[in-house]
């Protein structure tokens, strides 16, 4: 059920910076049986859903909705990150009345910390991943995903929220980072660049990939996203790099083929349910993990980031469709919607595999490997 179109399992290489998109960029749906906030009236959201700030917009968990679009989240604002060499364009401004984080954009004013003070925190995302410096943690077991295979009906909401394209996920998609570390998927969204310009958020040794997918999850310890914001491990994001390959990726095509319908900022459509796990790499055992933040306002920290070592392959045409179809507010294209990479400030990125051993062509000089901090958790 995994995508065969993934790149080889070589450690990620590259390093570029981008803007983060934890809760602010996409709407995060609420958990199945938990109450969640509602979107402001007038937003075509189904009852019971609400906008939460951060890695895209995170909705609160709400009780099983009686409606097909039962989980519905509104767009959360994202903040700009200063100083990226490839400064993202000013195209992801979202202006939503009554939302403290609604006035932000990529690559321009206002500065994100003014939108949300947490954006100036010490442990922000995204970051540059240096496999040679990652701490090998044997305790990091293969990720477990359950319930990610969805029938075509009910359909899912696919929305252009002005700073990304977001797919709201239904209740029941369960993910475990390890024993006792259980989460429920809320939404997924993408980050991309522009023609000839990569747009992943995380980078590997300074290399930026063409695009990146984020699947945002809420810890089962919390009923609502707003309760989890800023709490260590309250939110978890699975991230994978998208690269160019020779073949069309059939799983992604189910979404990319519908982008023209939502070209306009704020528009949405319904897409048949699909195998959500097919949008991720097939190898759930090799990944990097660290604690960071949402990559968009409110930039809440305590987010557990899991970045797959394996990449997902899309055709050149598909990557072009992703970066050249959607529009943000006004007459600006929705492109380069990534935050600049943020300093680690002493954080150690852990790896579930020995990434620093013969894993990179740049490993000629001896490297001081960090030790694993997560003994058994």
């Amino acid at each position: 059920q995994r995508l065969p179109r993934m790149q080889e399992d070589s450690p990620l290489g590259g390093g570029s910076s981008g803007e983060d998109d934890p809760l602010g960029e996409e709407d995060l749906p609420s958990e199945e049986d938990s109450p969640r906030e509602e979107d402001p009236p007038g937003e075509e959201d189904l009852p019971g859903e609400e906008d939460l700030p951060g890695e895209e917009d995170l909705p609160e968990v709400k009780p099983k909705s009686e409606e097909e679009g039962s989980l519905k989240l509104e767009d959360l604002p994202t903040v700009e990150a200063p100083g990226d060499p490839q400064e993202p364009q000013n195209n992801a401004h979202r202006d939503k009345e009554g939302d403290d984080q609604s006035h932000w954009r990529y690559g321009g004013d206002p500065p994100w910390p003014r939108v949300s003070p947490a954006c100036a925190g010490r442990f922000q995302s995204p970051v540059d991943i240096r496999p040679q410096l990652a701490a090998f943690c044997p305790a990091l077991r293969p990720l477990e995903l359950l319930g990610f295979q969805l029938p075509p009906l009910p359909e899912l909401r696919l929305r252009n929220n002005g700073h990304s394209v977001q797919l709201t996920l239904p209740p029941g998609l369960e993910m475990a980072l390890g024993p006792g570390r259980e989460y429920r998927a809320l939404q997924l969204h993408l980050h991309w660049g522009a023609a000839g310009r990569p747009g992943s958020e995380h980078t590997v040794e300074g290399h930026r990939f063409p695009a990146e997918i984020h699947v945002v999850h809420l810890s089962t310890a919390f009923a609502r996203v707003d309760e989890a914001l800023g709490r260590p491990g309250g939110l978890a994001v699975l991230a994978a790099f998208l690269e160019e390959g020779p073949e069309e990726n059939s799983a992604y095509e189910q979404l990319l083929s519908r982008l023209e319908e939502i070209a306009e900022e704020g528009s949405e459509t319904q897409v048949p349910g699909l195998d959500i796990s097919a949008l991720l790499p097939s190898d759930f055992s090799r990944y990097f993990q660290y604690e960071g933040s949402l990559t968009t306002p409110p930039c809440a920290q305590g987010v557990i980031w899991t970045v797959f070592n394996q990449t997902v392959m899309l055709s050149a045409k598909q990557l072009h469709t992703l970066s050249d179809t959607l529009w943000g507010p006004g007459d600006s294209r929705l492109q380069l919607n990534f935050r600049a990479t943020q300093p680690l400030n002493g954080r150690v990125i852990e790896a579930s595999f020995p990434a620093g051993v013969d894993s990179s062509p740049r490993a000629a000089e001896p490297v001081q490997l960090n030790s694993c901090l997560a003994a058994g958790d």
């Epitope: 009686e66 409606e67 097909e68 969805l150 029938p151 075509p152 009906l153 009910p154 029941g172």
Partner: antibody, heavy 119, light 111 residues
Framework: EVQLVQSGGGVVQPGGSLRLSCAAS????????MSWVRQAPGKGLEWVSA????????YYADSVKGRFTISRDNSKNTLYLQMNSLRAEDTAVYYC????????????WGQGTMVTVSS | QSVLTQPPSVSGAPGQRVTISCTGS?????????VHWYQQLPGTAPKLLIY???NRPSGVPDRFSGSKSGTSASLAITGLQAEDETDYYC???????????FGGGTKLTVL
């Protein structure tokens, strides 16, 4: 009260046509996908057709493809099943059901209506 | 022949525990699609008993539970009661057929 009330069943000759209706109340019909499921006398359940919430996408079982048409009128909160070229093997109780559960379950059912195809 | 296979009948004495199996294939249950269970009393429409493999809708007694493993699923009924005597169906989605599929049904007899 959440309910689906069906009508339109009856006796029809082979090759004939019949239109079933399913009126919804007590829930936001236009937000839900819907299906038709049938049960031949003394037999098990068989899914027949499904339609998305906005009516834009339809699905059919191979056994009825090309003969049956599912549709809906959200302004009237009503689901339909137009059955043409009916055969004896289409004889069954037909149920309309709500596909509202994200996991693919049918959580609200109509009372059922009998369709008998006989000469 | 049904896509999902159930035993035609099972039986148990009052108070006992019975299980009803539902066996599918790699294109339905084994593909990761959820299994749902329905109870159908004579002359009435089916009623959702278990959805998403293990979840009970409100109003369904906790005597009913569901599980799933590999290409099969099971419905367990504990503390069997006379009113449990009726037909039970499992249901899933099949990606090869692009269809929602049911088991053939199981008649539960309370001895």
């Amino acid at each position: 009260e959440v309910q689906l009330v069906q009508s339109g069943g009856g006796v029809v000759q082979p090759g004939g046509s019949l239109r079933l209706s399913c009126a919804a109340s007590g829930f936001p019909f236009s937000s839900y996908a819907m299906s038709w499921v049938r049960q031949a006398p003394g037999k098990g359940l068989e899914w027949v057709s499904a339609i998305s919430a906005n009516g834009g996408t339809t699905y059919y079982a191979d056994s009825v493809k090309g003969r049956f048409t599912i549709s809906r009128d959200n302004s009237k909160n009503t689901l339909y099943l137009q059955m043409n070229s009916l055969r004896a093997e289409d004889t069954a109780v037909y149920y309309c059901a709500n596909n509202g559960n994200y996991r693919g379950a049918f959580d609200i059912w109509g009372q059922g209506t009998m369709v008998t195809v006989s000469s | 022949q049904s896509v999902l296979t159930q035993p035609p009948s099972v039986s148990g004495a009052p108070g006992q525990r019975v299980t009803i199996s539902c066996t599918g294939s790699s294109s339905n249950i084994g593909a990761g699609f959820d299994v749902h269970w329905y109870q159908q009393l004579p002359g009435t429409a089916p009623k959702l008993l278990i959805y998403g493999n293990t979840n009970r809708p409100s109003g369904v007694p906790d005597r009913f539970s569901g599980s799933k493993s590999g290409t099969s699923a099971s419905l367990a009924i504990t503390g069997l009661q006379a009113e449990d005597e009726t037909d039970y169906y499992c249901q899933s989605y099949d990606s090869r057929l692009s269809a929602w599929v049911f088991g053939g049904g199981t008649k539960l007899t309370v001895l």
